[in-house]
Amino acid sequence: KSSNEATNITPKHNMKAFLDELKAENIKKFLYNFTQIPHLAGTEQNFQLAKQIQSQWKEFGLDSVELAHYDVLLSYPNKTHPNYISIINEDGNEIFNTSLFEPPPPGYENVSDIVPPFSAFSPQGMPEGDLVYVNYARTEDFFKLERDMKINCSGKIVIARYGKVFRGNKVKNAQLAGAKGVILYSDPADYFAPGVKSYPDGWNLPGGGVQRGNILNLNGAGDPLTPGYPANEYAYRRGIAEAVGLPSIPVHPIGYYDAQKLLEKMGGSAPPDSSWRGSLKVPYNVGPGFTGNFSTQKVKMHIHSTNEVTRIYNVIGTLRGAVEPDRYVILGGHRDSWVFGGIDPQSGAAVVHEIVRSFGTLKKEGWRPRRTILFASWDAEEFGLLGSTEWAEENSRLLQERGVAYINADSSIEGNYTLRVDCTPLMYSLVHNLTKELKSPDEGFEGKSLYESWTKKSPSPEFSGMPRISKLGSGNDFEVFFQRLGIASGRARYTKNWETNKFSGYPLYHSVYETYELVEKFYDPMFKYHLTVAQVRGGMVFELANSIVLPFDCRDYAVVLRKYADKIYSISMKHPQEMKTYSVSFDSLFSAVKNFTEIASKFSERLQDFDKSNPIVLRMMNDQLMFLERAFIDPLGLPDRPFYRHVIYAPSSHNKYAGESFPGIYDALFDIESKVDPSKAWGEVKRQIYVAAFTVQAAAETLSEVA
């Protein structure tokens, strides 16, 4: 049967029917329902929400909806022994203590079970010592401190501002610098946009607001005790000493009122330049230690959190495909939140809920997608992408054979300025074509397409008349699907104007103030941006699941591969003498990219011409498209990061949130001038060029005519 026969409705009508069924009012209602109490991973509140979602997805019409549970390592504060930081005098008396909780927002004063701010997976400890201010605690910040300013962090407690990079990278950098504790704080320069009031009167962070978050360096491992395998009932668990990615020094987050008290006394070196100054009325001295009058005072951390193996619950819904039930298109987003989750994750979960409802409505009218659609409500994303990773580990054999695409659905908004998309190059054309068909929700773009407003507000740096689409990094649930399994992936959300708002993320991220009211009052009162994101995410899923030929364009991969090869070559060419000395050549990589380009071009020609009524040939061509992303996977993984297996993309080793291209070569070249054994270092560069060239060539050959 053709897909039109199987589904009884013409493809054009299907997509329109699906999109027309999506309603802003429903998303609003779902968001309200999901945000009235906290849904912290491993709590009864979050389990109840899982059961509610399971029940509602069944009502919406999915074929089956199951809970998948895993027993993973989570981290919680000690309920009777709170975490805090103090300034102590020479007698050891605590003369200042940081706050134990955030003042609750209006209307939430009586809510129980709000987890106090903490850094998940911090070890216990009560270190005391002098403070060193390390800016954002990025790799380059520690280079500046250690190499230029000759400041030694060994045995010190460092204080770092949130922003720019994933907090886990900050902690890793501090550990490597020898610090014995880390204090993370939100500086108004990064979390308070000028001209906007703080919550509840605006969307800015109040002084008592604190960002929670995990500080792991998992590198894609999932549950720290069961890397590579699902944390099921018969799992063999590592001892805590062998667990993956746990920090070794105590870490704690604070707000800017408390940070002011610590930073105002800082002495020692002045900040190296203005980029080290935030917006507090403090000198931003680097230290170590406090200034003159306060030089005998020290900082002491009191951290009593515990790591516990805890049961988590994913919700997995299935809408069986009519023609290719063994091909899976997955829409997934997490359900667990740090507190109320007004934006993260429930603005995404509410959109998924409405997408499921719309698909269910079509199914009840007799329609089915061509391919199977799986819907997922992931648990424990905030604790290291655990729910999605454990499920993918458990189902890896199915996914690597049947996975067509994964669309992520965390926060639908981080602003209300324009669209933001990160995806595999295979999806560029899908995203372009879809957004040309959708209406822009933006003021001043009435009657214009989403593509037009997006392109105007966020133009591509390379191609005029096209919007910016970014590389996938990590820090969200697509990680295991894309970076480990090589399943084509994408994500979309509404974002801020990065040019005018230079704060990191959105100000109230992971704080108690991330409420329904934050969204309804300040970000999206009409829920029109949420609706647009639902249309983009849902539209992508619809096309991926229903188009006869998969909507992937392999030529776009060819274009970016050339761009990435040029970029990594120019990085390497900063060392022309060494390249000559060690005979480093990129010829093999450029040759492979050229071959890929030519083969992709020929494949695309065949794709236009083949007989689509022949189900065997159709399946063959679609399989070549589906397996192209898989072909970029190196089964051995990247050096010291076995679960990051994609050769073209990986999360940056210096910032988990950012994507890096040709990461193996990039990491081999990074700071190569400081390596003690240059011959060995350049040998590794050559090896990584070899791996990259081979992988690109091998991927190209999967697109060649099969015989």
């Epitope: 979050n46 009586n110 009932e233």
Partner: antibody, heavy 121, light 107 residues
Framework: EVQLVQSGAEVKKPGASVKVSCKAS????????ISWVRQAPGQGLEWMGE????????YYNEKFRGRVTLTADKSTSTAYMELRSLRSDDTAVYYC??????????????WGQGTTVTVSS | DIQMTQSPSSLSASVGDRVTITCRAS??????LNWLQQKPGKAIKRLIY???SLDSGVPSRFSGSRSGTDYTLTISSLQPEDFATYYC?????????FGGGTKVEIK
């Protein structure tokens, strides 16, 4: 549906021990713990302790520590409460109740029918 | 230990009456309070959890509320099957403690 079925009534002499069982069905045993509560004749309810079979963790009311032992058998989805050195004021109805195994929970949702323990010489 | 003081210890009411039972906590317990119903020869039943959330299958005439450390169970229109003993339970901190109970009898 969720059911907690307790063992039958017991008559014990002072100084003896009693072991009450609570067989669970209708849910995943290891996703929940079992709390034990007692009620002396004409009196209110008193929490004795709880056990979480998945982790094997037990938590006791200090009043009963050293005299009560909570155990669980995952293979049969059964929890046990043993009370030693019985006294006449241990005469009571002993209840088991289900509690979610998680950092935050809503305490006891489903209760057993109760087991009467009479301590008399 | 947290003390839960429940009042009244007993009350007589007629079918259709509005009934309120109160528990006072000796210290802050947030919303960590449940209301239980006990009938002779039957398993204890949880009616309300987290101060005000109704358990599934519990009639909407039952409701819970809070004012500071005072917690109230309200039965808006007493029905014949509601004659029973009611207990509050705090689970904010161990050991968990119960109120002394309120016996609701037919007037």
């Amino acid at each position: 549906e969720v059911q907690l079925v307790q063992s039958g009534a017991e008559v014990k002499k002072p100084g003896a021990s009693v072991k009450v069982s609570c067989k669970a069905s209708g849910y995943t045993f290891t996703s929940y713990g079992i709390s034990w509560v007692r009620q002396a004749p004409g009196q209110g309810l008193e929490w004795m302790g709880e056990i979480f079979p998945r982790r094997g963790n037990t938590y006791y009311n200090e009043k009963f520590r050293g005299r009560v032992t909570l155990t669980a058998d995952k293979s049969t989805s059964t929890a046990y409460m043993e009370l030693r050195s019985l006294r006449s004021d241990d005469t009571a109805v002993y209840y088991c109740a289900r509690v979610f195994d998680g950092y935050y929970n809503y305490a006891m949702d489903y209760w057993g029918q109760g087991t009467t323990v009479t301590v008399s010489s | 230990d947290i003390q839960m003081t429940q009042s009244p210890s007993s009350l007589s009411a007629s079918v259709g009456d509005r009934v309120t039972i109160t528990c006072r906590a000796s210290q802050d317990i947030g919303s960590s309070l449940n209301w239980l119903q006990q009938k002779p020869g039957k398993a204890i039943k949880r009616l309300i959890y987290a101060t005000s959330s109704l358990d599934s299958g519990v009639p909407s005439r039952f409701s819970g509320s809070r004012s500071g450390t005072d917690y109230t169970l309200t039965i808006s229109s007493l029905q014949p099957e509601d004659f029973a003993t009611y207990y509050c339970l705090q689970y904010a901190s161990s050991p968990y403690t119960f109120g002394g109970g309120t016996k609701v009898e037919i007037k």
